[in-house]
């Protein structure tokens, strides 16, 4: 019986060009975490395996950093990074737990300021 629950940072926002930490935490279970996958919609971003450590998908290597912990840091954010992110915890003996985070990447306040107040 799966008793665990995934706690996530929920809905979060960040500025374009900035960075954000995606965090999930598995609680209320004694199951052993064997692997955590991070996905963005239908793309595999990264995997943290208990034996092998981190694997970052090559196409995201420049903008994704492992950690802290089992979390994932997204850097140099663009508006296209807006969307759903999933942490998928593979555990033994429970099975798989999935958490969801929605990230909204906003135009930076500097960019908004520049657009509204033009120097003559």
């Amino acid at each position: 019986m799966m008793t665990g629950t995934i706690e996530t940072t929920g809905n979060i926002s960040a500025e374009k060009g900035g960075s954000i930490i995606l965090q999930c935490h598995l609680s209320s279970t004694t199951a052993q975490v064997t692997q955590v996958n991070w996905e963005q919609q239908d793309q595999l971003l990264a995997i943290c395996n208990a034996d092998l450590g981190w694997h970052i998908s090559p196409s995201f290597k420049d903008r994704v950093a492992p950690g802290p912990g089992l979390g994932l840091t997204l850097q140099s954010l663009t508006v296209n990074d807006t969307g759903e992110y999933f942490c998928i915890y593979h555990t033994y003996p429970d099975g798989t737990y999935t958490g969801r985070i929605f990230l909204e990447v906003l135009e930076s306040s500097v960019a908004e300021h520049g657009a509204r107040f033009q120097i003559p």
Epitope: Q35, L44, I47, D51, L52, H55, S59, H90
Partner: antibody
Amino acid sequence: EVQLLESGGGLVQPGGSLRLSCAASGFTFSSYSMHWVRQAPGKGLEWVSSIKSSASYSSYADSVKGRFTISRDNSKNTLYLQMNSLRAEDTAVYYCARVPYDYWMDYWGQGTLVTVSS
Amino acid sequence: DIQMTQSPSSLSASVGDRVTITCRASQSISSYLNWYQQKPGKAPKLLIYAASSLQSGVPSRFSGSGSGTDFTLTISSLQPEDFATYYCQQSYSTPLTFGGGTKVEIK
């Protein structure tokens, strides 16, 4: 250099048994999940069985469930496939493969041929 | 079980041609799709994993794309050593399943 070397194949009569071995070297065997995949003569690839790094969990194709048993000895860096109640349709080349992160097979052995015939 | 349908089952091409092989899953498999190359009498070789990641040591003329149910393997400029059979494989759930293969032959 990563190497996987299968052995134990041969000719066996229907209903008979064989035990295949896969000797691993060049990497930390105990950190990787492993698969057995087979290929009947002139046919495509068919997944047979998987085992996790710690041997805590294994899974099987329906076609071999209850007849084949996958196991591993991490102290000997060896993967096994015990095949019982063999049938003519089990005739194939059997490959072992290393599976990083449980998702892709990055190294394969050269294969061992199992022929089930009377 | 997830069915993997590969097309075409065979194709004839010339050295230098751009070759595209498609693979369709019977349900969404996210990006858990791998591509292998196999030559006669040899073990399969991993080319692409996780739909689009090029395996170390594989020439950059090979590329993979797609997510969900539809995937593509592209060889940008076919070389003599590329004549072989190519298989897709889903690793989303067990039983793991392969496509039927695409044999790339010399025209």
